[in-house]
């Protein structure tokens, strides 16, 4: 680490379903990119992190009282679905085209 | 600190508009409770932190590779408006009953 944290952004996060114990029911894919929101929410909050008014307020309070209040947090603000092949309760391989909320589409400061 | 962070929850955060430089345009109230989302998003994520599938996946990956991936973050998931009195461009004190997104209503793990 350089010591300077980068600003809030979407980064790759390859997830192997075997690593998290979901390979018992998800047949395919074996892995996917969940992405991750990484980096700091620094003052001034840029438009690209789509800050809420509360995030702006919290950032300003943190600036004034850094030990009392934390910074806003870099989190997923929009998620995307992935397609999965899974075994249904009859053991039949079934395709779910839109398995919602599995991958980060956008990150922001909240 | 006890060393054990509490779980993700809403806590009081009194904000004085003078402290953040907004007293130049917000006349009243002088301060309000913005609330703050504080605490950790620990495995297993409880229902009350309304985790997304992505947050659950990230939590599981963090459990397996704690140095590679961060925990999900405790953030506002629902915001409430406050009422403010401000001076418009004619110098007329004007009430905005619903100044949106200023106060935390609910926290969750994202």
């Amino acid at each position: 680490s350089t010591g300077a944290s980068s600003h809030c952004q979407k980064t790759s996060l390859r997830v192997n379903f075997e690593d998290i114990g979901w390979d018992s029911w998800i047949i395919a894919p074996k892995e996917y990119d969940a992405y991750e929101c990484k980096g700091g929410c620094f003052f001034p909050l840029a438009d690209d992190v789509t800050p809420t008014k509360h995030a702006i307020v919290q950032t300003l309070v943190h600036l004034k009282f850094p030990t009392k209040v934390g910074k806003a947090c870099c989190v997923p603000t929009k998620l995307s679905p992935i397609s999965i092949l899974y075994k249904d309760d009859m053991g039949v391989p079934t395709l779910k085209y839109h398995y919602e909320g599995m991958s980060v589409a956008e990150c922001g400061c909240r | 600190s006890t060393g054990a962070s509490s779980h993700c929850q809403k806590t009081s955060l009194r904000v004085n508009f003078e402290d953040i430089g907004w007293d130049s345009w917000i006349i009243a109230p002088k301060e309000y409770d913005a609330y703050e989302c504080k605490g950790g998003c620990f495995f297993p994520l409880a229902d009350d932190v309304t985790p997304t599938k992505h947050a659950i996946v990230q939590t599981l990956v963090h459990l397996k590779f704690p140095t590679k991936v961060g925990k999900a973050c405790c953030v506002p998931t629902k915001l409430s408006p406050i009422s403010i009195l401000y001076k418009d461009d004619m110098g007329v004190p004007t009430l905005k009953y619903h100044y949106e997104g200023m106060s935390v209503a609910e926290c969750g793990c994202r």
Epitope: - | I27, A28, P29, K30, E31, Y32, I82, S83, I84, L85, D88, M90, G91, V92, P93, T94, L95, Y97
Partner: antibody
């Protein structure tokens, strides 16, 4: 700058009606509520009611509700206050004033003296 | 309706003295953390002038010697150093609810 110019003094007989006008300039007429306040000689201020020029919605003081009518003509940025069935104790200076939804009366007209005498 | 009671009825002070005018409401004028209390100055033969709003904020062009304070039901208008031109009647007004009501006024005289 904001200006509220009211119509001239009136002398009326008891039982008659009076209509006072208030011509606004220097701001967007539909932006603020127009209030009417009266002041009897040597007395305090008495709020009569308010009208929203944008949609014409009104709030009247119960005391005047049966006798007062507030209207606007947006095309000429003018507000009107009509008081009917006049009595001698309606003798007063009538003011128009503007304020926002907060209700503070920021700008005032010069006042119109209405004298009710037989 | 909300009744506003002003005191004293008359205040007679010398130039440079501090004037303290009181206004008491029959119920709280606070809502949303905002005090719906306003003060006006009226000189003889003139329309009222907007002095203080939301209990403690000065209207445009009002000299710094005029200040307001209070919350709930008890409010104060203070003139820190009276000037001869401050001779006037001062009215409080609540804008919390309809009917908007005024206090009976305090007459400030300069000795």
């Amino acid at each position: 700058q904001v200006q509220l110019v009211q119509s001239g003094a009136e002398v009326k007989k008891p039982g008659a009606s009076v209509k006072v006008s208030c011509k606004a300039s220097g701001y967007t007429f539909t932006r603020y509520w127009m209030h009417w306040v009266r002041q009897a000689p040597g007395q305090g201020l008495e709020w009569m009611g308010e009208i929203n020029p944008s949609q014409g919605g009104t709030n009247y003081n119960e005391k005047f509700k049966s006798r007062v009518t507030m209207t606007v003509d947006k095309s000429i940025s003018t507000a009107y206050m009509e008081l009917s069935r006049l009595r001698s104790d309606d003798t007063a200076v009538y003011y128009c004033a503007i304020g926002s939804n907060y209700g503070g009366l920021v700008y005032w007209g010069q006042g119109t003296l209405v004298t009710v005498s037989s | 309706e909300i009744v506003l009671t002003q005191s004293p009825a008359t205040l007679s002070l010398s130039p440079g003295e501090r004037a303290t005018l009181s206004c008491r409401a029959s119920e709280s004028l606070d809502n949303y953390g905002i005090s719906f209390m306003n003060w006006f100055q009226q000189k003889p033969g003139q329309a009222p002038r907007f002095l203080i709003y939301a209990a403690s904020n000065q209207g445009s062009g009002i000299p710094a010697r005029f200040s307001g304070s209070g919350s709930g039901t008890d409010f104060t208008l203070t003139i820190s150093s009276l000037q001869p031109e401050d001779t006037a009647v001062y009215f409080c007004q609540q804008s919390k609810e309809v009917p908007r009501t005024f206090g009976g006024g305090t007459k400030v005289e300069i000795k």
